[in-house]
Amino acid sequence: GSGIFQLRLQEFVNQRGMLANGQSCEPGCRTFFRICLKHFQATFSEGPCTFGNVSTPVLGTNSFVVRDKNSGSGRNPLQLPFNFTWPGTFSLNIQAWHTPGDDLRPETSPGNSLISQIIIQGSLAVGKIWRTDEQNDTLTRLSYSYRVICSDNYYGESCSRLCKKRDDHFGHYECQPDGSLSCLPGWTGKYCDQPICLSGCHEQNGYCSKPDECICRPGWQGRLCNECIPHNGCRHGTCSIPWQCACDEGWGGLFCDQDLNYCTHHSPCKNGSTCSNSGPKGYTCTCLPGYTGEHCELGLSKCASNPCRNGGSCKDQENSYHCLCPPGYYGQHCEHSTLTCADSPCFNGGSCRERNQGSSYACECPPNFTGSNCEKKVDRCTSNPCANGGQCQNRGPSRTCRCRPGFTGTHCELHISDCARSPCAHGGTCHDLENGPVCTCPAGFSGRRCEVRITHDACASGPCFNGATCYTGLSPNNFVCNCPYGFVGSRCEFPVGLPPSFPWVA
């Protein structure tokens, strides 16, 4: 602790100029004071001034008023500093002395004589307010006031609390009257050394080194550090924890940069054609009649479908076509004939048959020829016989379909089963599902491909009801029940009127 006992001398009256021994001063009492401050004593005794002592120069003769003086000799109020915790009680002895000698240092002069003394004992709290008092004896009167204040940077009731205002990285604070710290705006903590981050800054993912800042830890971003940073290079994905890349719908791959829904994202098929996705960046356009090309971007001639019959020639017009009919035919498509079998209308060895009592005819064409008059060689690809995007190729009198990967059959109508590779070991039954083959394992085996031999047979306990067949290896629980018609449920325990579409997995 550290503080100062301050004593302000105000007025001393010794009208008769007398000493304590009854003698008078000649020519007058040249007065100085000795002050002794010590710990509280019920009865004041001689001995060391434990809290300090001080002397003044000569302040006046006989009676005088003492003016305040802030520096140099004769300073008033008098200062008695202490370096301990102020106990709240004290004893004070003020003695007035006459000196015949030096004004400035009367203490050292021989022949000094006591004029009077006063003793004060009591309690005194630390504070700025002066306590004023006046002491009289038969010859003299002394007016004075006193107080105890804390030294700079000391606070509290006993000046025991050291506090120095600070604004550096070990603290940003001012000192309260009791010596506690009052943090400067933007700072917190016992020593006001912790900055208050930007409001809302994530407690774990963000931090700050100065107020109203929010610095993100690795893997986090955003004003409040509450947004994770996805994997570097993540194109169409998001994260819930840093460095993740969870793909948006329709995207796949490590960086979510493989387009699984090219049709929706890019709409590559033109002119109302149908788009089908087929793996990353793969798609097929199925054109409406009258269009062709990879993206159905090419408009076919209106005459491409050979609408004119009976050898009529087709002429393209702006939005339609016009048939020029050969002699003996009329109608929009030259479908009406003015000819009879007598006119030998059937070409390429076709046989003529009379119709409507000879007013019209019909030609029966030999193989590889077609048309009302057998005038057209058969194009076996016209009817688009190849399914699933297969390519049709004419081969003399016949045609073949070149199938896309994953399809087979004369017309590419068969999907090549994932099960064709017989992926299921140990006699497991293969099921083609959208996401690949699934194996239903016989008793004693499990695993995705029935490759794991299990010592415990999950079917041994007969978990399936109503005559259902039990299989193992299809699920974490190691058995499935394949329900008979009319039953559903994980153990085929519920009767319904609908057949199950796939075995219930237990």
Partner: antibody, heavy 121, light 107 residues
Amino acid sequence: EVQLQESGPGLVKPSETLSLTCTVSGGSISSSSYYWGWIRQPPGKGLEWIGDIYYTGSTYYNPSLKSRVTISVDTSKNQFSLKLSSVTAADTAVYYCAREDVILRGGSDYWGQGTLVTVSS
Amino acid sequence: LYVLTQPPSVSVSPGQTASITCSGQRLGDKYASWYQQKPGQSPVLVIYEDSKRPSGIPERFSGSNSGDTATLTISGTQTMDEADYLCQAWDRDTGVFGGGTKVTVLG
């Protein structure tokens, strides 16, 4: 008990960069109560504070050295490092790392044993 | 630039009191620390926050700080106290050391 250990080359050529690492053991460098400082002492002279760092990466440097100093922290290794660029013979000194305690009002209660770095060609 | 000034040397007889001063502008408004350094060794903190002793430091070491001067006092000085003593304070965000005082214990 907390221990600090400086490591790095004892000889550096003029104009090159001096690099030292301080490894902290027996306590976490990520405590909010401490800063981690570098101090040097040229032969026969007094101490000179170089700079310090908080576990979050906040740094404070001596203005007279600021243009040449970089202090960094690696909390995963419980280490902090000093880099002093463009060195001259005047940078020859014993380099200490120390823990500065907020509770001790910035007093350094733990020091490394020091490592002598000589700048010479 | 904040400067702390110490006398280069102080001599004291065993058992006597040694006082080492450290001067700086308004140093009393800053917290002073004192370090003891023996030849070839790292500094050791002996006083922090003007007058507080870390655990393990003998009671004969005391400190005060007011006005422009901080003082380290070693009462009942022993031969083992012969060392360099350095004061330190913080000026804003910069650590500042005094030049050091060599304490010689006579006899």
